[in-house]
């Protein structure tokens, strides 16, 4: 029985050209996390494997950085990055847990203050 729950950063509104962190946290289960996939729509952005570490998809290498933790940092945001992002936790023995985060990327005049900083 799958007892775990995924908590996310929550939906985010960010500024074009800026950076944001997407994070998920799996709680309420003792299942072992074997791999975390980060996806947008049907595109794989990155994989964090418990044994093999991080793999960033070649098409996102310039703009996606691993971490912090099992999270993902998106840099040099464009309006085209607006959309839904998925953290997919592969666990044993529970199976798969999925978290969802919607990111809205706006021109600088309307982006929320909290997401305006650049992450080093």
């Amino acid at each position: 029985m799958m007892t775990g729950t995924i908590e996310t950063t929550g939906n985010i509104s960010a500024e074009k050209g800026g950076s944001i962190i997407l994070q998920c946290h799996l709680s309420s289960t003792t299942a072992q996390v074997t791999q975390v996939n980060w996806e947008q729509q049907d595109q794989l952005l990155a994989i964090c494997n418990a044994d093999l570490g991080w793999h960033i998809s070649p098409s996102f290498k310039d703009r996606v950085a691993p971490g912090p933790g099992l999270g993902l940092t998106l840099q040099s945001l464009t309006v085209n990055d607006t959309g839904e992002y998925f953290c997919i936790y592969h666990t044993y023995p529970d199976g798969t847990y999925t978290g969802r985060i919607f990111l809205e990327v706006l021109e600088s005049s309307v982006a929320e203050h909290g997401a305006r900083f650049q992450i080093p």
Epitope: N11, I12, Q23, T82, F102
Partner: antibody
Framework: EVQLQQSGPELVKPGASMKISCKAS????????MNWVKQSHGDNLEWIGL????????SYNLKFKGKATLTVDKSSSTAYMELLSLTSEDSAVYYC????????????WGQGTSVTVSS | DVVVTQTPLSLPVSFGDQVSISCRSS???????????LSWYLHKPGQSPQLLIY???NRFSGVPDRFSGSGSGTDFTLKISTIKPEDLGMYYC?????????FGGGTKLEIK
């Protein structure tokens, strides 16, 4: 003036599919998310999903995945929601609603489209 | 999904009354950047829902200042300071912080 004009009421048979349109005017269509909301049983409001006109990206309430398909035609500034394999449970009023930038709220709503599923 | 609970379900009022509607969520509506996406709507019979308040406490354009929103975390309140006839209808809160967005069950504001 921002306006969202929806297509008229529909009476459809169980098992059929149908498409509701929502024509936007008075603003830059590609600059704002478009949401779809179901009002059933008089008072209950449910978020069906959204579409990003700029890139065609979608997000669905899992309850409506496979039931609703969202698309846009940028050339006519129109959003569409197709409802599939209709049953009596799908009888409701459906609204399109523009997303308020930055705040994940819905600032302008269409007038609603009443859908009745009956044989 | 985040469960949003509104109270009361029904609110009988007299014109001129001050009323409060409560909205509670099953988890915090503050995102990791400290922004809280909680909005309020009025749905009058035969009309479309209309946005009243967004981001907890910001009045949408054209909304009278007798409407005010407050709260944080999981507890939020809509206050109407002096009820007028045009305020009657169903009030809904909506959380937009977590996917999927979810509405409260609604509060019916009606005459005593």
């Amino acid at each position: 003036e921002v306006q969202l004009q929806q297509s008229g009421p529909e009476l459809v048979k169980p098992g059929a599919s149908m498409k509701i349109s929502c024509k936007a005017s008075g603003y830059s269509f590609t600059g704002y998310i478009m949401n779809w909301v179901k009002q059933s049983h008089g008072d209950n409001l449910e978020w069906i999903g959204l579409i990003v006109p700029y890139n065609g990206g979608t997000s669905y309430n899992l309850k409506f995945k496979g039931k609703a398909t969202l698309t846009v035609d940028k050339s006519s500034s129109t959003a569409y929601m197709e409802l599939l394999s209709l049953t009596s449970e799908d009888s409701a009023v459906y609204y399109c609603a523009r997303g308020l930038q930055r705040f994940y709220a819905m600032d302008y709503w269409g007038q609603g489209t009443s859908v009745t599923v009956s044989s | 999904d985040v469960v949003v609970t509104q109270t009361p379900l029904s609110l009988p009022v007299s014109f001129g009354d001050q009323v409060s509607i409560s909205c509670r969520s099953s988890q915090s509506l503050a995102n990791s950047y400290g922004n809280t996406y909680l909005s309020w709507y009025l749905h009058k019979p035969g009309q479309s829902p209309q946005l009243l308040i967004y981001g907890i406490s910001n009045r949408f354009s054209g909304v009278p200042d007798r409407f005010s929103g407050s709260g944080s975390g999981t507890d939020f309140t809509l206050k109407i300071s002096t009820i007028k006839p045009e305020d009657l209808g169903m009030y809904y809160c909506l959380q937009g912080t977590h996917q999927p967005p979810t509405f409260g069950g609604g509060t019916k504001l009606e005459i005593k």
